[in-house]
Amino acid sequence: FGDEEERRCDPIRISMCQNLGYNVTKMPNLVGHELQTDAELQLTTFTPLIQYGCSSQLQFFLCSVYVPMCTEKINIPIGPCGGMCLSVKRRCEPVLKEFGFAWPESLNCSKFPPQNDHNHMCMEGPGDEEVPLPHKTPIQPGEE
């Protein structure tokens, strides 16, 4: 009975990143977290932006960075495509600026492959949004 080969993929244990179309990941993630608990802690700081609703792709995008997709067939984690990153950034960066913050360097879109192909696999996301969202003000108490 030899040693079992180390599991390549682990179940996603972060609640906000479950039921997004893939369910396994492998750490470290694309920003260097070794543990899912650390990734979740960082992800929670984006809750105000997610609730604001600047982009329907934001949650998927963040999860693809903090818990990238894993497949037994490929050794490297599969993160977001640059196109999805740019789409999310275009819609959410102005909102972040309203809060007083800049787009994080850790989410620099140039770090991600421009598109999904055999050489550089990445996730395109749940569909681009071309319809402009109505302007939303920051969520007030009692609003959902």
């Epitope: 809750t47 105000p48 609730q51 994080p104 920051p138």
Partner: antibody, heavy 118, light 107 residues
Framework: EVQLVESGGGLVQPGGSLRLSCAAS????????MHWVRQAPGKGLEWVAS????????YYADSVKGRFTISADTSKNTAYLQMNSLRAEDTAVYYC???????????WGQGTLVTVSS | DIQMTQSPSSLSASVGDRVTITCRAS??????VAWYQQKPGKAPKLLIY???SLYSGVPSRFSGSRSGTDFTLTISSLQPEDFATYYC?????????FGQGTKVEIK
């Protein structure tokens, strides 16, 4: 406009209890980490406790663990700090603060003074 | 717990001077380090977040940088309203911890 207003401070004897309130306006407290930070007279800042209502997370400094309880009433958009078994070294101005992106404490209340003395 | 050792504890400077304040983390930390300014009787105000990002509305004479476990706040040209106490703070990993503070006084 974002505002945090603390209340509930005052003079209390050692071993006594006090409950501080932090009324938030201009944002939904549920989606943010809310913190209590204190500052003893003439001293520096000391983090006390944090709550993230959205997931029910609470965190405490070792110096207050087991004595202080942080909570929030999201219907009132208010955070609380229940302080029990108070000691002289708990004397400080207590600030309520919000953090959002990158763990930065971007908004602070004006502070409320807690004096523990016999 | 991660300790943030801030130096110097106080300094005297003149208007127009370049001022540098350093915080050293006791172990490796993320870049979730912020700097605050506090004036007597007032709440702290956020200046810098993520080690080097300038918070909205803060004058550009304030800047932050990181080198390993050393975090630095620089005021390029000290103004009369900058005389205050400055604190660093790390967050996101274990308890939030503040530096001891640096009081910037008029020479």
């Amino acid at each position: 406009e974002v505002q945090l207003v603390e209340s509930g401070g005052g003079l209390v004897q050692p071993g006594g209890s006090l409950r501080l309130s932090c009324a938030a306006s201009g944002f939904n407290l549920s989606y943010y980490y809310m913190h209590w930070v204190r500052q003893a007279p003439g001293k520096g800042l000391e983090w006390v406790a944090s709550i993230y209502s959205y997931s029910g997370y609470t965190y405490y400094a070792d110096s207050v663990k087991g004595r202080f309880t942080i909570s929030a009433d999201t219907s009132k958009n208010t955070a609380y700090l229940q302080m029990n078994s108070l000691r002289a070294e708990d004397t400080a101005v207590y600030y309520c603060a919000r953090s959002s992106f990158a763990w930065a404490f971007d908004y602070w209340g004006q502070g409320t003074l807690v004096t523990v003395s016999s | 717990d991660i300790q943030m050792t801030q130096s110097p504890s106080s300094l005297s400077a003149s208007v127009g001077d370049r001022v540098t304040i350093t915080c050293r983390a006791s172990q490796s930390v993320s870049s979730a380090v912020a700097w605050y300014q506090q004036k007597p009787g007032k709440a702290p105000k956020l200046l810098i977040y993520s080690a080097s990002s300038l918070y909205s509305g803060v004058p550009s004479r304030f800047s932050g940088s990181r080198s390993g476990t050393d975090f630095t706040l620089t005021i390029s040209s000290l103004q009369p309203e900058d005389f205050a106490t400055y604190y660093c703070q790390q967050g996101g990993w274990g308890p939030f911890t503040f530096g001891q503070g640096t009081k910037v006084e008029i020479k």
